[in-house]
């Protein structure tokens, strides 16, 4: 006994990325300790009066919690005790974004860490083949993004070749008004080859391969984000 | 006691719109999420979507993004949910409930008794 | 969209204890798709049982448990009683969209 709250503990916590109208997780992990009585977590933001969350003695205290965050914020309760202080945030919004401090208090010490959390909205592509267009053409359709990303295509047989001069890409606002559907057309695309159609922004980079043959058509799809960790 | 009572049966046109209340008592109003749910016979129950009150914060199922739109007056502590263009498949009981989110536990408790609604010509 | 299933019907005695399952279509049933079961009685009487997975909606009795077992959520009533006949419909969150089962009816 006699020390308590006099030395620091390791907290660590991993840059990441909220995508909007979903559910989000913001990291932070810190040295265990079995009594979770004597464990505070306090969540904080940049440019906020109040917190964004209090778990303390085992439970919530929302009493000085910013109005923003009211009803949205809620930490993994029974997982506090092998130190994880990870926030669970419903229904990302972009105004979300920002510089967060993640701050623990235990019987062992005292720390904290911050994180940058980022907001927008990233899906996965889905390429199929536009049987209705005059020639054979690939349509690659991705439902939300945010902000505006890029578009570009690229193929296994002609490798490093610009398809943008027979590709056409559109962006069209979803009904909450931020977020875009994306739409990209490529023209003259041939048989026996694997098409890419890559979408990407300042959050999240997702891909979509398809390889189109005389007997069948395959599909990938897959989504990372950036700056994470 | 907590309580959520809704606004009374519906008979409508199609075409027409209609608008349900459901008055929280008993608790923070704002502090927790409303979900409104359908229930048609036979096809069990369908999540329609859910409100903050006191926020613009809601969540639609994809399904019925066109069809409903709901509203929060904290002043009166009720919750609304217009549903618009009426067909015979908007038929049901609609029922709004509370919805806690948090660190010990997120859970559906108080429902409404619910608000017949009945699209005929 | 995911589909959930559960149970139809199940049948149990009084004082018995009964399982009820969740499925989902998508794969395993995890503790992030805060499972929630709700008891409807006649007369559109819905009341929140378990949330969060295996969390007791205060006021609910303890006969009445939550928890994960394999792939699926599952409700547990330790010792029914006559008035536990009822329906029981399980819900699943799935990231920004709660789907709900078919429901079970306990006879």
């Known amino acids: 006994f006699g020390i308590s709250g006099k030395h620091f503990i390791t907290v660590t916590t991993f840059t990441s990325a909220g995508n909007i109208g979903e559910d989000g997780t913001l990291s932070c992990t810190f040295e265990p300790d079995i009594k979770l009585n004597g464990i505070v977590i306090q969540w904080l933001k940049e440019g906020i009066k109040g917190l964004v969350h209090e778990f303390k003695e085992g439970k919530d205290d929302l009493s000085q919690q910013h109005e923003m965050f009211r009803g949205r914020t809620a930490v993994f309760a029974d997982q506090v005790v092998v130190g994880n202080a990870s926030l669970r945030l419903k229904n990302v919004q972009l105004t979300d974004a920002g510089t967060y401090t993640c701050y623990i208090r235990t019987s062992k010490g005292k720390g904290n860490a911050n994180l940058e959390y980022k907001t927008g909205a990233f899906s996965m592509p889905e390429i199929n083949v536009d049987y209705n267009a005059s020639s054979e053409s690939l349509r690659c359709e991705a439902p939300r993004w945010f902000p505006q990303p890029t578009v570009a295509w690229a193929s296994q047989v002609d490798q490093g070749a610009n398809f943008s001069e027979v590709s056409n890409t559109s962006f069209e606002l979803n009904s909450e008004n931020v977020t875009m559907k994306v739409v990209s057309v490529l023209y003259n695309v041939t048989i026996n080859n694997t098409y890419s159609c890559m979408i990407e922004n300042d959050i999240a980079k997702a891909t979509g391969d398809i390889k189109v043959t005389d007997s069948e058509v395959k599909r990938r799809s897959q989504l990372q984000l950036l700056n994470s960790g | 006691q907590v309580q959520l009572q809704q606004s009374g049966a519906e008979l409508m046109k199609p075409g027409a719109s209609v608008k349900m209340s459901c008055k929280a008592t008993g608790y923070t109003f704002s502090s927790y999420w409303i979900e409104w749910v359908k229930q048609r016979p036979g096809h069990g129950l369908e999540w329609i979507g859910e409100i903050l009150p006191g926020t613009s914060i809601t969540t639609y199922n994809a399904k019925f993004k066109v069809k409903a739109t709901f509203t929060a007056d904290t002043s009166s502590n009720t919750a609304y949910m217009q549903l618009s263009s009426l067909t015979s498949e908007d038929s049901a009981v609609y029922f709004c409930a509370r919805y806690y989110f948090g660190s010990s536990s997120f859970y559906f408790d108080y429902w409404g008794q619910g608000t017949s609604l009945t699209v005929s010509s | 969209q995911a589909v959930v299933t559960q149970e139809s019907a199940l049948t149990t005695s009084p004082g018995d204890t009964v399982t009820l399952t969740c499925r989902s279509s998508t794969g395993a049933v995890t503790t992030s798709n805060y499972a929630n079961w709700v008891q409807e009685k006649p007369d559109h009487l819905f009341t929140g049982l378990i949330g969060?997975?295996?969390n007791r909606v205060p006021g609910v009795p303890a006969r009445f448990s939550g928890s994960l077992i394999g792939d699926k959520a599952a409700l547990t009533i330790t010792g029914a009683q006559t008035e536990d006949e009822a329906m029981y419909f399980c819900a699943l969150w799935y990231n920004n969209h709660w789907v709900f089962g078919g429901g079970t009816k306990l006879e």
């Open positions: 969060g997975t295996n």
